[in-house]
Interface confidence: medium
């Protein structure tokens, strides 16, 4: 599923991401935009043999199990394919674990490069939340 901007903002808010660990909803929507272009089925392969999955491009080396990533830790204890569902529950729950890990949203390269320090509230402007 490819979410609309406000549709995703509403879904993320419903799942408790607004101000989770101090990160406003705009940060999460911005991250999803530049990680996956709001596409729940996005997959991207990395040079280390791991793959990033879903709307928040969660990595198989650390967070999920895709059955083929050397030394995978599967810290979210889920199959990576669960992160590709049109229901974003699994991605959100795993993202909450990631953002609580110490580096906050710096874990997402796209957030670090494209969202951090910008007017992220623009990503939820005009949305009925």
């Amino acid at each position: 599923k490819v979410f609309g901007r406000c549709e995703l903002a509403a879904a993320m808010k419903r799942h408790g991401l607004d101000n989770y660990r101090g990160y406003s909803l705009g940060n999460w929507v911005c991250a999803a935009k530049f990680e996956s272009n709001f596409n729940t089925q996005a997959t991207n392969r990395n040079t280390d043999g791991s793959t990033d999955y879903g709307i928040l491009q969660i990595n198989s080396r650390w967070w999920c199990n895709d059955g083929r990533t050397p030394g995978s830790r599967n810290l979210c204890n889920i199959p990576c394919s669960a992160l590709l569902s049109s229901d974003i529950t699994a991605s959100v729950n795993c993202a909450k674990k990631i953002v609580s890990d110490g580096n906050g949203m710096n874990a997402w390269v796209a957030w670090r490069n494209r969202c951090k320090g910008t007017d992220v509230q623009a990503w939820i402007r005009g949305c009925r939340l």
């Epitope: 089925q41 392969r45 895709d66």
Partner: antibody, heavy 116, light 107 residues
Framework: QVQLQESGAEVMKPGASVKISCKAT????????IEWVKQRPGHGLEWIGE????????YYNEKFKGKATFTADTSSNTAYMQLSSLTSEDSAVYYC?????????WGQGTTLTVSS | DIELTQSPATLSVTPGDSVSLSCRAS??????LHWYQQKSHESPRLLIK???QRVSGIPSRFSGSGSGTDFTLSINSVETEDFGMYFC?????????FGGGTKLEIK
């Protein structure tokens, strides 16, 4: 136990298309990548590409883009590879395998012969 | 693409001999190298994963070693059932690639 069962041998004419199937049993089909591999005598093994059945995500070896198309049906736990515009170069044994990085589980292979 | 070069192309041995098969990668692939055996008209069978991890059910006479670009599959005291083709495969990057194979034949 994990098993991959491929469809039977095919004899096709040049220019035609063929669809090979790979039925998986013994594991959660949607969560593992299915890989496709080509073997021709004297050419060794070639990786064609892969599909993640749960999402339909696909990756192709550049060499096979436009030649191979992958699909999967999670209701029947079956992956498919369609090969189009067949030529004699496509005559080979085609394998599906479960993609764990390594390939512990293979289908028995489908022999494709392209001949006029 | 990462090229895998296997040598020798053919190895003629007598049962009871010990042999070493080589696989060399065109660039470093850490330990992301796997070995397969294939007998005529059969699917490949995984022997060793991640350069040195013997797969369940594979006899202890098979062992693997190496890291980076140079890898070796060793068979200690070859048995008649070991004759066939041996392939290496890398999973360090895409596209996945295989070596050209080493044929192990009876002398």
């Amino acid at each position: 136990q994990v098993q991959l069962q491929e469809s039977g041998a095919e004899v096709m004419k040049p220019g035609a298309s063929v669809k090979i199937s790979c039925k998986a049993t013994g594991y959660t089909f949607s969560t593992y990548w299915i890989e496709w591999v080509k073997q021709r005598p004297g050419h060794g093994l070639e990786w064609i590409g892969e599909i993640l059945p749960g999402s339909g995500s696909t990756y192709y070896n550049e060499k096979f883009k436009g030649k191979a198309t992958f699909t999967a049906d999670t209701s029947s736990n079956t992956a498919y590879m369609q090969l189009s515009s067949l030529t004699s170069e496509d005559s080979a044994v085609y394998y599906c395998a479960r993609g764990d990085g390594w390939y512990c589980y293979w289908g028995q292979g489908t022999t494709l012969t392209v001949s006029s | 693409d990462i090229e895998l070069t296997q040598s020798p192309a053919t190895l003629s041995v007598t049962p009871g001999d010990s042999v070493s098969l080589s696989c060399r990668a065109s660039q470093s692939i850490s330990n992301n190298l796997h070995w397969y055996q294939q007998k005529s008209h059969e699917s490949p069978r995984l022997l060793i994963k991640y350069a040195s991890q013997r797969v369940s059910g594979i006899p202890s006479r098979f062992s693997g070693s190496g890291s980076g670009t140079d890898f070796t599959l060793s068979i200690n005291s070859v048995e008649t059932e070991d004759f066939g083709m041996y392939f290496c495969q890398q999973s360090n990057s895409w596209p996945r690639t295989f070596g050209g194979g080493t044929k192990l034949e009876i002398k």
